[in-house]
């Protein structure tokens, strides 16, 4: 889970070992601050949990583009 | 340890409704989700509906739509099932069952509450 | 929805023998969410293995889940005495509904 305990920076100190299937995420966002440990993703899922990720994994990759491309073409 | 502690055995006359509690303890209740399943004499595995207090979101399969009622008290960490309109067919072990939301698989189980619909 | 077909319907076999049972789903379970379930007379499920291959916590290694897409199968490498008993797969991709197969009967011979 993230963790917010100097806000507003939040940061993540470890990630998920299992994949989340892209049907379970909401959106996404990225934790680049100097103020934390690495550097991370930040799933937000449809059951309205966060969850930390690693950016150089593929499947995480993989979807930030899926949810890249939802934004880019919104359903009618 | 999660642990899931069901109501006990229940009687009831067809046409009327039952209600089936489930205590949680030894985990984060509002983080996870409880689904229902529900096995009749001799039959497998049917999958009757979940709610996952966090989001929000109670979810039924569609043949007990508009029969069945999921609700979570999270103050107690229970959830509870209300079927109603019983039918002689709804006998049943009716179980309990914790899921994460993000994935489904069911973790772990409460001891099974028969109910049995008779005349 | 997805319908999950398990086969065989029963399973007769001897202790140390190796069990492979079998999942069919009748569209793709993508990113393989699926599970397996021993129930015993009398008792809860108990959950064996998640994502089709991850084995739950405590479960012996002679478990192993596998497979992707519509065909997953389970296997106990060397069956015990305490492993006769009824196996149920579910798949959880679809929210709503998760469903199980109708389950296999692993029977003493």
């Known amino acids: 889970q993230p963790d917010a305990i100097n806000a507003p920076v939040t940061c993540c100190y470890n990630f998920t070992n299992r994949k989340i299937s892209v049907q379970r995420l909401a959106s996404y966002r990225r934790i680049t601050s100097s103020k934390c440990p690495k550097e991370a993703v930040i799933f937000k899922t449809i059951v309205a949990k966060e969850i930390c990720a690693d950016p150089k994994q593929k499947w995480v990759q993989d979807s930030m583009d899926h949810l890249d491309k939802q934004i880019q073409t919104p359903k009618p | 340890q999660v642990e899931l502690v069901q109501s006990g055995a229940e009687v009831k006359k067809p046409g009327s409704s039952v209600k089936v509690s489930c205590k949680a303890s030894g985990g984060t209740f509002s983080s996870y989700g409880i689904s229902w399943v529900r096995q009749a004499p001799g039959q497998g595995l049917e999958w009757m509906g979940a709610i996952n207090p966090l989001a929000g979101h109670t979810h039924y399969a569609q043949k007990f739509q508009g029969r069945v009622t999921i609700t979570a008290d999270e103050s107690t960490s229970t959830a509870y099932m209300e079927l109603s309109s019983l039918r002689s067919e709804d006998t049943a072990v009716y179980y309990c069952a914790r899921y994460d939301g993000i994935y489904g698989e069911l973790d772990f189980w409460g001891q099974g509450t028969l109910v049995t619909v008779s005349s | 929805d997805i319908v999950l077909t398990q086969s065989p319907a029963t399973l007769s076999l001897s202790p140390g023998e190796r069990a492979t049972l079998s999942c069919r789903a009748s569209q793709s379970v993508s990113d393989a969410y699926l599970a397996w379930y021993q129930q015993k007379p009398g008792q809860a499920p108990r959950l064996l293995i998640y994502?089709?291959?991850s084995r739950a916590t405590g479960v012996p290694a002679r478990f192993s889940g596998s497979g992707s897409g519509t065909d997953f199968t389970l296997t106990i490498s060397s069956l015990e005495p305490e492993d006769f008993a009824v196996y149920y797969c579910q798949q959880y991709i679809t929210y709503p509904p998760f469903t199980f197969g109708q389950g296999t009967k692993v029977e003493i011979k």
């Open positions: 994502d089709a291959s």
